[in-house]
């Protein structure tokens, strides 16, 4: 795997330079991302800007054309004229890029997790890993209360409660996931540590419950299961502490480290080529979506001002929260980087999953955004497990507009309960099966409100949950651009750098190889360890 | 203190329209949805349905959809329950209750109760 | 819907006697049960609610317990003014629905 080669000190320590991913320099970030902003002038000039921006336009133009695609088709008769079969051949191209995704997720998470947790020392991963999960509790946290404050604003239960003019049409509670609290925070833990590494790559743990007659009384009782579905959260885990265990080994790990990253590599290859067929993907994810819809204006004029104060809370987090945090902390132009991730951001939209747009994610950040490898690779799988902005105020507007519906007062207790609980769940949705409604319904039984209503959430789902993933993958790449940031700065401010730091018993004199004419600054240093690791390096195992 | 007041006892035609009102006072009307429930001669107590008082908005029990509106007079913290085209099934006691605003689905005051006799 | 049954429709006690109401949930209510009652004639009262939980003024020789299906309501004194129909009733899930009432009489 290409490293930069280090750079000798005189105290013998080798500070490893945080560009060491093959992707452009530090300080040049800025100069990276200007081909994105500052596109006028000549009709040459013009041509190139489209040229380096190909994907993001096509991208954009994607969705757009799948809105419009889907609309048409709808006004033509929609699913109904299609037929099942039809439609599942419209939906088919949408269907084969989220398979390419998915495809790639597993070895994608696990290799990069081993690799970047491989490459810090404990100390960095230790700090790194902190000073992440501290900016997504936050930036949770923040999401919960503006959920929170907008619903109470613009009251969406008081203006929907007309959608509710018959019981039946609230749902009953046998649609409602009915799941102790307790448990639901029991299996998160037991997907923390899976029993079988290779069914935690398909499979996670459930409870569901039996009735059982016990002494004349029917008692329910808790069962656990597997269900369908990766267990990601316990596969983030293992890979993480499988990574500081192939670290702690020395250079006897260094092998398999090497392996790790070189699978690495190799996967963002494939993600390189499957970017190019987002565009088609995403159209048709899109406009299948929306054909698949039955009386979508009939269910914006009943639910308009719910999702409406769920598109404006993602859109005040998304715009401007999340940007003013990156932008206090830096010092850059926030919209700058995000122009660097609109792709991923249109896939997170097209297909409505984190994980799934974690591969596209990595690719920009590093190549567009100057994020190095060891911090993107370990950050951004953590952030699509942990990082839950979106998920964490849709919950929370849900919860109030629930209130608003069926007329149940939230006072201050209730509303904090709300926001920890909120936070609390969105973290842990990635362990829990059946994530959004299950996590909604266990904020719910919290604060003691109706479950009955949840059909109604589900009703628009398919809309609401497409603008939370884009906030969710958002965050999770500004949390990333951030910790780059903390690198950058902590490295500059010390003569031993804090972070990406490799002792060194022996003196070094590497060879560069030069690998770009016209960038001295990129060279490749092949370290046995790949990122951000030195030949002879001798630490002491911990 | 709280109390929900009633109107007195009606007894009606069969095909005739019937109004029973519910005053509350003692708190803020809008605050607390207003549900009502019938009571059956020697028989249990049926949840007919509430209404959102803040929106205004009627739900109705799957029982009582058609012939009975719930509507409101806010200014004078008032509810109605009225049924239409009334038959003799109809007769009954007929209770408003303030529904809680916590604690899901209970009712923690209640009117006196509004006779309803239906007879030819 | 949640079928609500009290298997005892009339129930006679003694002054000073511990009269014990039960009530069964066709399925798991998660604990949202409410008793109240209601006197010859007159109107209803909440006595409990959330199982145990109980409403203001009503007097402390009434307790509630339970959970899942099974409940009871707890008349620790019996007093004269205690004569009256019992209700239970689940607020789990829409439509609220009642039990069939237990008739407490003096023996």
């Known amino acids: 795997m290409a490293v930069d080669p280090p750079k000798a000190d005189p105290k013998g320590v080798v500070a490893v330079d945080s560009t060491a991913n093959g992707g452009p320099a530090l300080g040049s970030r800025e100069d990276q991302s200007a081909k994105a902003g500052g596109c006028c002038g000549s009709r040459d000039r013009v041509r190139r800007c489209i040229r380096a921006n190909l994907l993001v336009l096509l991208t954009v133009a994607a969705v757009v054309a799948g809105v419009g695609l889907g609309l048409g088709v709808s006004a033509a008769g929609g699913a109904d004229a299609l037929g099942p079969a039809r439609l599942t051949a419209f939906a088919f191209p949408g269907e084969l890029l989220l398979r390419l995704l998915k495809m790639i997720i597993l070895p994608l998470v696990v290799c990069s997790l081993i690799g970047g947790a491989a490459s810090l020392d404990p100390g960095a991963l230790g700090r790194l890993g902190a000073w992440a999960l501290l900016f997504f509790l936050v930036t949770t946290l923040l999401a919960s209360a503006l959920g929170v404050g907008l619903a109470l604003a613009l009251q969406p239960g008081a203006a929907s409660a007309a959608i509710n003019a018959s019981v039946g049409a609230a749902g009953s509670a046998e649609n409602a996931p009915s799941k102790e609290v307790l448990d639901s925070f029991l299996d998160l833990a037991r997907n923390i540590f899976p029993s079988n590494l290779v069914s935690a790559a398909f499979r996670s743990y459930s409870t569901t419950y039996e009735e059982r007659n016990i002494t004349g009384t029917r008692v329910k009782v808790p069962v656990g299961q597997e269900v369908e579905g990766m267990n990601i959260l316990g596969l983030v885990v293992f890979a993480i502490v499988f990574g500081v265990a192939l670290r702690k080994l020395g250079p006897e790990g260094e092998l398999l480290i090497r392996f790790f990253n070189s699978f690495n590599e190799a996967t963002m290859v494939l993600v390189s080529w499957i970017m190019w067929y987002a565009p088609v993907g995403i159209m048709f994810l899109v406009a299948g979506k929306i054909v698949e819809m039955e009386d979508v204006g009939l269910l914006f004029a009943r639910l308009g001002k719910y999702i409406l104060c769920c598109l404006l809370g993602h859109a005040i987090h998304g715009l401007l929260v999340l940007p003013l945090i990156y932008f206090l902390f830096t010092r850059k132009n926030p919209y700058r980087f995000l122009w660097g991730i609109v792709t991923p951001l249109a896939t997170a939209f097209g297909t409505s999953s984190s994980s799934a747009t974690l591969p596209l994610m990595m690719k920009c950040v590093e190549e567009n955004n100057g994020v190095a490898k060891h911090i993107s690779r370990f950050i951004l799988p953590i952030g699509a497990t942990v990082n839950m902005d979106g998920a964490a105020l849709f919950q929370c507007v849900a919860a109030v507009f629930i209130a608003q519906l069926s007329q149940q007062s939230l006072d201050f207790v209730k509303i904090i309960t709300i926001l920890v609980t909120a936070t609390a769940s969105s973290v842990g949705a990635a362990g829990i099966p059946a994530g959004g409604v299950l996590t909604l319904a266990i904020i719910l039984e919290a604060v003691n409100l109706p479950v009955d209503h949840i059909s109604l959430i589900l009703a628009v789902d398919w809309l609401v949950d497409r603008s939370c993933t884009v906030l969710n993958v958002e965050g999770d790449a500004l949390g990333a651009g951030l910790l780059q940031n903390y690198v950058d700065r902590t490295e500059s401010r010390s003569t031993e750098p804090e972070l990406i730091q490799v002792k060194s018993e022996l003196p070094l004199d590497p060879l560069p190889v030069p690998t770009e004419e016209g960038n001295p600054l990129l060279k490749h240093y092949r370290g046995p360890a790949g990122d951000a690791t030195v030949a002879s390096e001798k630490e002491s195992v911990m | 203190q709280i109390q929900l007041v009633q109107s007195g006892p009606e007894l009606k035609k069969p095909g005739e329209t019937v109004k029973i009102s519910c005053k509350a006072s003692?708190?803020?009307?809008?605050?607390?949805?207003m549900s009502w429930v019938k009571q059956v001669p020697g028989k249990g107590l049926k949840w007919m349905g509430w209404i959102h008082t803040y929106a205004g908005v009627p739900i109705y029990g799957d029982d009582f959809k058609g012939r009975f509106a719930f509507s409101l007079e806010t200014s004078a913290s008032t509810a109605y329950l009225q049924i239409n085209n009334v038959k003799n099934e109809d007769t009954a006691t007929y209770f408003c209750?303030?529904?809680?605003?916590?604690?899901?689905?209970?009712?923690?005051?209640w009117g006196q109760g509004t006779t309803l006799t239906v007879s030819s | 819907d949640i079928q609500m049954t009290q298997t005892t429709s009339s129930l006679s006690a003694s002054l000073g006697d511990r009269v014990t109401i039960s009530c069964r949930a066709s399925?798991?209510?998660?604990?949202?049960l409410n008793w109240y009652q209601r006197k010859p004639h007159g109107t209803v009262k909440l006595l409990i609610y959330y199982t145990s939980r109980l409403h203001s003024g009503v007097p402390s020789r009434f307790s509630g317990s339970g959970s899942g299906t099974d409940y009871s309501l707890t008349i620790s004194n019996l007093e004269q003014e205690d004569i009256a129909t019992y209700f239970c009733?689940?607020?789990?899930?829409?439509?609220?629905?009642f039990g069939g009432g237990t008739k407490l009489e003096i023996k």
């Open positions: 399925q798991d209510i998660r604990n949202y």
């Open positions: 003692g708190y803020t009307f809008t605050t607390f949805g």
């Open positions: 009733q689940q607020g789990h899930t829409l439509p609220p629905t």
């Open positions: 209750a303030r529904r809680s605003d916590n604690y899901r689905y209970f009712f923690d005051y």
